[in-house]
């Protein structure tokens, strides 16, 4: 798949036709709900789910050079070959302890909610972003992160939990999403997909992308995870895409590089501490964000969720690599660990920059369809 | 407040047994099932060394010392992980702490194993 090329930190709307076009409003699907396909490996559907994961393309990530063009989620094209139709993922997880119910797994019994009622709650993640509707927030400011570039000493811990690799983060890793919205870093990890199968947990306009990092914040308004949990904003994460591009990702491979010595599920090793900000996108200011929960169970509510705008470029070796070293439960392969996305309830997605305003020449007058909640706007 | 209590710990002749547990007790009962529960261990002197693990999924990895003679289980009903030690070595004397693993890292306070020869 070819990526249009993106114009950096230029406006939307400020190519002129062709591939600098960011997505216009005739480009929005024609029904409420973005286009579907299949059911992912995630859990049973909820009553009244409409929003249901679709899976597309192959993946991609991005070299951090200013002068490069990135991608940006408002220039991805909306029409897309339709993927195989994805089935639940069924080579995986025979549950040791046959119907414990706490054993919870992607793609299959049991269903999550039992695993978590709160996994039944109205306001899940993840979601379906659609960038026409999101509502504009000059109050969102540009993220800062403080202390993410980590000293190689002390090591870190690399771990296949049986649902995903985890990067255990040291303490001092402090992220703002605001004057007063203060974070500290404790984790991160990745979802994916299998070969020829995009394993993003968030969507754009029903596109799914290879694969999704999340890094886990807890508020600095509590001292431990389980007094955060369920608490609004006591959770924070930090989301990026990441796609397919030409060059291998150096900051990426310091992590892939070692997924070899943690094939197995429960394994784990001691990586150097590296510089996390370098496996986020590069710009700061350009974000979409939501309040849902946490996307494995117990499914937590309150969690703050910010999805950059701007990608991240893998490989195709990479992206490989990491959909086909990690073994999970049951002598089955980790992958397709994303959760189906879940209907938003009313609730509006709030974007730092003006991504459902069109001011390209296709559109008579900018559209904008929802407006900022925020205080102070 | 969370807590993460082992027990069992004790003093045994080398080729006994003995049995630890890793209790979750406060709000950590509530994300305990959820958690990638390891033992740690850490003898005078030494850097703590990982034993065992299960994932919340109920798959287990040993180290190569202790594979074929302990293994690691969950109760999730109690809110318990248990290590089985068996045929036990003058060797596996140190201090093992439970770890628990749900977003961050929770530890006990450890409790003391000594194998006399």
């Known amino acids: 798949q070819r990526l249009p090329r993106m114009q950096e930190d230029s406006p939307l709307g400020g190519g002129s036709s062709g591939e600098d076009d960011p997505l216009g409003e005739e480009d929005l699907p024609s029904e409420e709900d973005s286009p579907r396909e299949e059911d992912p490996p995630g859990e049973e559907d909820l009553p009244g789910e409409e929003d249901l994961p679709g899976e597309e393309d192959l993946p991609e990530v991005k070299p951090k050079s200013e002068e490069e063009g990135s991608l940006k989620l408002e220039d991805l094209p909306t029409v897309e070959a339709p993927g195989d139709p994805q089935e639940p993922q069924n080579n995986a997880h025979r549950d040791k302890e046959g119907d414990d119910q706490s054993h919870w797994r992607y793609g299959g019994d049991p269903p999550w909610p039992r695993v978590s009622p709160a996994c039944a709650g109205r306001f899940q993640s993840p979601v379906d972003i659609r960038p026409q509707l999101a509502a504009f927030c000059p109050a969102l400011r540009p993220l800062e992160l403080l202390g993410f570039q980590l000293p190689p000493l002390p090591e870190l811990r690399l771990r296949n939990n049986g649902h995903s690799v985890q990067l255990t983060l040291p303490p001092g890793l402090e992220m703002a999403l605001g004057p007063g919205r203060e974070y500290r870093a404790l984790q991160l990890h990745l979802h994916w997909g299998a070969a020829g199968r995009p394993g993003s947990e968030h969507t754009v306009e029903g596109h799914r992308f290879p694969a999704e990092i999340h890094v886990v914040h807890l508020s600095t308004a509590f001292a431990r995870v389980d007094e955060a949990l369920g608490r609004p904003g006591g959770l924070a994460v930090l989301a990026a895409f990441l796609e397919e591009g030409p060059e291998e990702n150096s900051a990426y491979e310091q992590l892939l590089s070692r997924l070899e010595e943690i094939a197995e599920e429960g394994s784990e090793t001691q990586v150097p501490g590296l510089d996390i900000s370098a496996l986020l996108p590069s710009d700061f200011s350009r974000y979409f964000q939501y309040e849902g929960s946490l996307t494995t169970p117990p499914c937590a509510q309150g969690v703050i969720w910010t999805v950059f705008n701007q990608t991240v470029m893998l490989s195709a070796k990479q992206l490989h690599t990491l959909s086909d070293t990690l073994w999970g439960p049951g002598d089955s392969r980790l992958q397709l660990n994303f959760r189906a996305t879940q209907p938003l309830n009313g609730r509006v997605i709030e974007a730092s920059f003006p991504a459902g305003v069109d001011s390209s020449p296709r559109a008579a007058e900018p559209v904008q369809l929802n407006s900022c909640l925020a205080a102070g706007d | 407040q969370v807590q993460l209590q082992e027990s069992g710990g004790g003093l045994v002749q080398a080729g006994g047994s003995l049995r630890l547990s890793c209790a979750a007790s406060?709000?950590?009962?509530?994300?305990?099932?959820?958690?990638?529960v390891a033992w740690y261990r850490q003898a005078p002197g030494e850097q703590r060394e990982l034993v065992a693990v299960?994932?919340?999924?109920?798959?287990?990895k040993y180290s190569d010392s202790v594979k074929g003679r302990f293994t690691i289980s969950r109760d999730n009903a109690k809110n318990t992980v248990l290590l089985q030690m068996n045929s036990l070595k003058p060797e596996d004397t140190a201090v093992y702490y439970c770890?628990?693993?749900?977003?961050?890292?929770?530890w006990g306070q450890g409790t003391q194993v000594t194998v006399s020869s």
């Open positions: 406060g709000n950590s009962v509530n994300i305990f099932r959820f958690a990638t």
């Open positions: 770890n628990a693993d749900f977003l961050q890292d929770y």
């Open positions: 299960i994932t919340s999924a109920g798959g287990t």
